[in-house]
């Protein structure tokens, strides 16, 4: 029997899946706070637009009986169980917020006919790309691969005069959900990253990684890994590193680099950190006061999901259009809306665009500094620091393959 959508006659609801298995180990109360804060803002915006309507959220909790591991790897069926709950209750909002786990989202897409929009704070994997009614509010793996390929190919910057075409990828399987799918995308033989490289090898053991650092016969000077500096230190410790090794540490959802008193530890000097440009206002928000720098982005994605719902509601109501239509379900893409922290842009496939930031450690000040930024919307790298104080020779990034014979440096222009 049909599930009725609580989505007409001046009353509009968003169904929020509150799953034990989540992309980030975030207490559900914090997610709820983010949603409620978003609802307050949406109500204000609709009122200001002269739209006298009611907007609410219904939180759908999983019972946690079957899926109690709390991580995304065991979440394949949890989203479907929650959908069954909705089906049994015969009640659904205009929009579904969640799940954040790639497996859950993928499975829900396979097993259901989703005629309503779905917003996710996560679903990072390539298997969730190009889904017609899915919107993802945290950078998916596809965006990372586009940055890496763009950066590898770049050879006309004062600090990067070589195109790279090789890489090691460290992936030991203990990564967080975002890292798991980011590295998965780099590992996949069909991915854009693999396609554009002439050599790529996945290192799965700590010892493999440690050996490469000083191996004269290594096939690449570049190692991509994902995690925070502490994760790198546990792996690398204070081991000696060959002078032309470059470690790219992907740590997108971590604002700790942008705290004023942070000094980069010595083991970070051979490392370029890829993270995201931080927002300002979120830091003082009532729901985020107790969040660590790594949790803000997840809570913010939920809040922005609510604001996106509000934006679409406003747009359709102002145009006198019906909300419970396929047109509404497919409209959550190719737009910019006013997020909590400024404008948020979604690409043609409903994936959030962002500014990625590549940081290096200044050998002079031992502080993190911005080397370049990358706009995912236009796939463009913008150099910021034209004379970086690198640890690498001549303050330039080395070639990805060390010349073992006479030192002829060929510039691949």
């Amino acid at each position: 029997s049909q599930v009725s959508q609580n989505c007409h006659n001046g009353s509009y609801e968003i169904s929020v899946l509150m799953m034990d298995n989540s992309a980030f180990a975030e207490p559900l109360e914090n997610v709820e706070d983010a949603v409620n804060e978003g609802l307050e803002i949406v109500r204000g915006r609709l009122q200001n637009a002269g739209l006298n309507v009611t907007v609410n959220a219904s939180f759908m909790y999983s019972d946690g009986l079957i899926h109690n591991s709390g991580d995304c790897r065991s979440s394949t069926c949890e989203g479907l169980d929650l959908l069954r709950k909705i089906s049994n209750a015969k009640r659904m909002g205009c929009v579904l917020m969640g799940p954040s786990c790639t497996y859950s989202t993928f499975q829900m897409y396979l097993d259901t006919e989703l005629s309503y929009p779905m917003i996710s704070a996560g679903s990072f994997g390539l298997s969730c790309d190009y889904k017609e009614t899915l919107t993802r509010l945290m950078s998916p793996a596809r965006k990372l691969t586009y940055f890496l390929v763009n950066f590898w190919k770049t050879n006309d910057l004062p600090f990067k005069t070589y195109s790279w075409s090789t890489s090691y990828v460290y992936k030991n399987g203990t990564e967080s959900e975002d890292c798991f799918w980011y590295l998965n995308a780099l590992e996949a033989s069909v991915s854009y990253f693999s396609h554009e490289l002439s050599f790529k090898l996945v290192l799965r053991q700590d010892k493999e990684f440690q050996d490469i650092l000083m191996d004269h016969n290594r096939k690449s000077n570049v190692i991509v890994m994902c995690g925070d500096p502490e994760f790198l230190y546990k792996l690398k410790g204070d081991r000696a590193v060959a002078e032309d090794i470059v470690i790219i540490l992907v740590d997108l959802f971590n604002d700790q680099y942008f705290e004023d008193n942070v000094t980069a530890p010595d083991y970070m000097k051979n490392v370029l950190v890829l993270t995201q440009s931080p927002g300002n206002s979120l830091l003082n928000s009532s729901f985020s006061r107790n969040l660590s720098p790594t949790k803000r982005d997840f809570a913010l994605a939920y809040l922005n999901g609510i604001l996106l719902f509000g934006h679409m509601l406003k747009t359709f109501l102002e145009n006198g259009e019906n909300i419970t239509t396929p047109k509404f379900a497919h409209a959550f893409r190719n737009l910019t809306f006013e997020g909590y922290d400024g404008p948020v842009t979604l690409d043609d496939w409903g994936d959030v665009d962002s500014t990625m930031v590549l940081l290096y450690t200044s050998v002079d000040t031992k502080k993190y500094k911005v080397l370049l930024t990358y706009d995912t919307h236009v796939n463009q790298t913008n150099p910021v620091d034209m004379s970086p104080t690198f640890t690498w020779k001549n303050s330039k990034l080395p070639n990805d393959i060390t010349d073992r014979g006479p030192q002829h440096h060929h510039h691949h222009h």
Partner: nanobody, 123 residues
């Protein structure tokens, strides 16, 4: 003493590009936030872009995706690259500096200003 000198302005057609330079002296760029501002005839001065002392660019919505900022500490110079220029971008462009209290945020106000360079976008 602390000085800022802008250059690179001129007349450009809509859709064209310009690169403005701000040569600084009397201070270290690492310790200062640099802002670019503009003032069109009969309008108030507005912030266009700021580069925090840590090197984080922050853009006004009106120029995001079109303007980029970079710095070369070795040359004590900050650059403003302007692409896809529109007639609305016509103004005198100023660079300004402020001793950084935060490495990652733009200051509320700037203490030191250049004399400005004229940018005219017209066909």
């Amino acid at each position: 003493q602390l000085q800022l000198v802008e250059s690179g302005g001129g007349l450009v057609q809509p859709g064209g590009s310009l690169r403005l330079s701000c040569v600084t002296s009397g201070f270290t760029l690492d310790d200062y936030a640099i802002g670019w501002f503009r003032q069109a005839p009969g309008k108030e001065r507005e912030g266009v872009i700021c580069l925090t002392s840590g090197g984080l660019p922050k853009y006004a919505d009106s120029v995001k995706g079109r303007f980029t900022i970079s710095r070369d500490n070795a040359k004590n110079t900050v650059y403003l690259r302007m692409d896809s220029l529109k007639p609305d971008d016509t103004a005198v462009y100023y660079c300004a500096a402020s001793g950084a209290t935060s490495r990652w945020n733009c200051p509320p106000q700037y203490d030191h200003w250049g004399q400005g360079t004229q940018v005219t976008v017209s066909s």
